[in-house]
Interface confidence: low
């Protein structure tokens, strides 16, 4: 940072991540004269917008402006006034809005229209709000973590986590878990990407990358839970659902109309003889795991190998950064340490899920019950997704690094998105024509 007495020769950028469960605003900063250096951009602020994701405002779009106010005002405070007009603002909406668009394009457009009008009222350089594709979400997450880890530079990074005797330029794979979708993105080893939908070609800093990516819509942790409930209520003999993914003693009433509100449960929809049912927790990890596995169709694969639901997945290669809800959930469960083996994680999950709900509430008194109640499911789901969905093993588990931030910046798609839209990732090394948006998405 420059000395306060002199004007800072820096630039700022704002990205809003409009996720399925909430919206977060990120402010990035970089030295103006070093725009094309690899790795000069860093996060200076994160502001979590109070309330749900923007897709929930479909019946109350007039409230969107108020909803965004606090964080946009925070941005106004953090960024010097002299910089406001030249600070770009981007909003990217992810799977929550993809689902809304599947239900009604008109409703999704209306929400985005009101969001755009609200954001245009601020003194920044608003660049638009759009629903990003799952492929973009995976790609930008991959770019973010590898940019922050210094993988795109020819220089050795002293803080690289790979000991320096090994090839420091090997990129990390990216594992992103949201509320409504999950993404897996990595560079396979000498493997043809058999499905064109899953192939990305980038040229970054003079090097070519052939990247595999897939976004599994409806397999974020919240939508996966809705799927599991919809599947399990089909075979319930009455309006009581004894659920192994919730703690013993936990009870919650669910409206059937809420259950079938999302497109993710359509495949399990049936006419039920009741409008509500009650979840009663029995807290059994093994049974919960079995129930979750039924969401993954592994019986059909038109490729040499698949993840699930007939989606191509090459053999896993290298280290992976697991972020967003992968990190938040595992951090809560105290399972992010490199030293914790997959067997130990499973053991801990068994113990955690078996703990009585009253005991859990006392132990975690400061945590909202809605979130607290779902950690058993979420932790079990993460294990099921990584092991059975993506085919990690007890051995390759040690290649998964649960990451919240890298050098002070959040791991996630937003930084990669801004880097691309502001043309700050040159195709050539050292400096050359920046990538156009269409180069790889």
């Amino acid at each position: 940072t420059q000395n306060k007495a002199l004007p800072e020769n820096v630039k700022y950028g704002i990205v809003l991540d409009a996720g399925s469960s909430h919206t977060s605003l990120y402010i990035y900063k970089w030295p103006a004269e070093k725009e094309n250096d690899t790795g000069v951009v860093h996060q200076v602020e994160e502001c979590r917008v109070k309330g749900p994701g923007i897709s929930k405002f479909v019946q109350k779009v007039n409230e969107i402006g108020i909803y965004l106010t606090d964080c946009m005002e925070r941005a106004r405070e953090v960024i010097p006034r002299s910089q406001h007009q030249e600070t770009p603002v981007y909003l990217g909406a992810t799977a929550g809005m993809r689902l809304l668009r599947m239900e009604s394009e008109e409703l999704a457009d209306r929400v985005l229209d009101v969001v755009e009008r609200s954001l245009s009222n601020y003194p920044f350089d608003f660049q638009g709000a759009r629903i990003i594709t799952g492929q973009e979400e995976g790609a930008y997450g991959w770019i973010t973590i590898n940019y922050l880890l210094g993988k795109f530079s020819q220089k050795t990074r002293w803080f690289s986590i790979v000991p320096y005797e090994t090839n420091n330029q090997e990129t990390f794979g990216a594992l992103d878990l949201g509320g409504a979708s999950t993404q897996v993105t990595f560079v396979p080893q000498n493997q043809t990407i058999e499905s064109p939908d899953n192939a990305l070609q980038f040229r970054l800093y003079g090097k070519d990358y052939n990247v595999y990516t897939h976004s599994f819509l409806c397999y974020g942790k919240d939508q996966a839970l809705w799927q599991k409930l919809a599947k399990d209520i089909q075979v319930a003999s009455n309006e009581i659902l004894r659920d192994p993914c919730f703690h013993p003693g936990y009870k919650k009433v669910v409206n059937v109309s809420d259950l079938y509100k999302t497109p993710c449960t359509k495949r399990f929809e049936m006419t039920l003889p009741f409008q509500q049912f009650e979840i009663q927790g029995i807290g059994n990890y093994q049974q919960c795991h079995q129930s979750i596995l039924e969401l993954f169709n592994t019986s059909y694969c038109p490729y040499s190998q698949c993840a699930f639901n007939g989606i191509f997945l090459p053999p896993l290669q290298g280290d992976f950064g697991a972020f967003s809800a992968f990190y938040f959930v595992m951090k809560f469960l105290n399972l992010t340490s490199e030293k914790v083996s997959q067997e130990k994680v499973t053991e801990m999950m068994k113990k955690f899920c078996a703990q009585p709900w009253e005991e859990i509430k006392t132990s975690y008194a400061g945590v909202k019950e809605k979130y607290l109640s779902e950690y058993c499911f979420s932790g079990t789901y993460i294990l099921s997704l990584l092991l059975q969905g993506y085919h990690f093993t007890a051995d390759s588990w040690e290649h998964i690094h649960f990451i919240g931030k890298i050098q002070g910046s959040d791991a996630g798609w937003t930084l990669g998105y801004m880097l691309n839209l502001t043309n700050m990732i040159p195709a050539e090394q050292p400096l050359s024509t920046p990538l156009s948006h269409s180069t790889y998405v």
Epitope: W30, T38, H42, G150, W158, I161, T336, K405, Q407
Partner: antibody, heavy 121, light 107 residues
């Protein structure tokens, strides 16, 4: 305001080991790299190695490879540097420092006060 | 490893005068160079990073320049509190290496 608080001075016998701690108080710890630098009496600064607590994997200067172990405990926001097979020339002040850099440009923007380790028979 | 050489080893300057400290790298380090100030009994303090960017709270009389292998730290008008040892450090390649230091003393 983030501070790096180091453990107290140590007197050690040749051949033994010393473990110095560095606790971050008042701010983010896990996501920043922590480096260890030593300074022998009247001498300059010498980098020993570093770690990003989030990942737990350390890098060491070749000179100290096999003798130094750098670890971090995220739950207590503490980094550790253990130096084994001590000899008299290891007598120095050992500093921990945070790399506050923006990935392209690294720099140690925050330092502990140092821990004096004296190796004497 | 990259060897950092600082010169002169000692610089005698009167208060109010200009001080120019030099740092040379045995191979290119780009602009990934930092300067630190250290006073007796204290930890080093960051002055400059990225070869030319002043750290937070560092007075404007301190400036850095250079890239590749030749770097300079300039103190435009020495104040009494500036008499100290100054180190340069490259942060491009392992091991991260420091120069031997330049002691700025009162003439």
């Amino acid at each position: 305001q983030v501070q790096l608080v180091q453990s107290g001075a140590e007197v050690k016998k040749p051949g033994s080991s010393v473990k110095v701690s560095c606790k971050a108080s008042g701010g983010a710890f896990s996501s920043y790299a922590i480096g260890w630098v030593r300074q022998a009496p009247g001498q300059g600064l010498e980098w020993m190695g570093g770690i990003i607590p989030t990942f737990g994997t350390a890098n060491y200067a070749q000179k100290f490879q096999g003798r130094v172990t750098i670890t971090a405990d995220e739950s207590t926001s503490t980094a550790y540097m253990e130096l084994s097979s001590l000899r008299s020339e290891d007598t120095a002040v050992y500093y921990c420092a945070r790399d506050g850099g923006g990935y392209q440009h690294h720099y140690f923007d925050l330092w502990g006060r140092g821990t004096l380790v004296t190796v004497s028979s | 490893e990259i060897v950092m050489t600082q010169s002169p080893a000692t610089l005698s300057v009167s208060p109010g005068e200009r001080a120019t400290l030099s740092c040379r790298a045995s191979q290119s380090v780009g602009s990934n160079l930092a300067w630190y100030q250290q006073k007796p009994g204290q930890a080093p303090r960051l002055l400059i990073y990225g070869a030319s960017t002043r750290a937070t709270g560092i007075p404007a009389r301190f400036s850095g320049s250079g890239s590749g292998t030749e770097f300079t730290l300039t103190i435009s008008s020495l104040q009494s509190e500036d008499f100290a040892v100054y180190y340069c450090q490259q942060l491009t390649k392992w091991p991260l290496t420091f120069g031997g230091g330049t002691k700025v003393e009162i003439k």
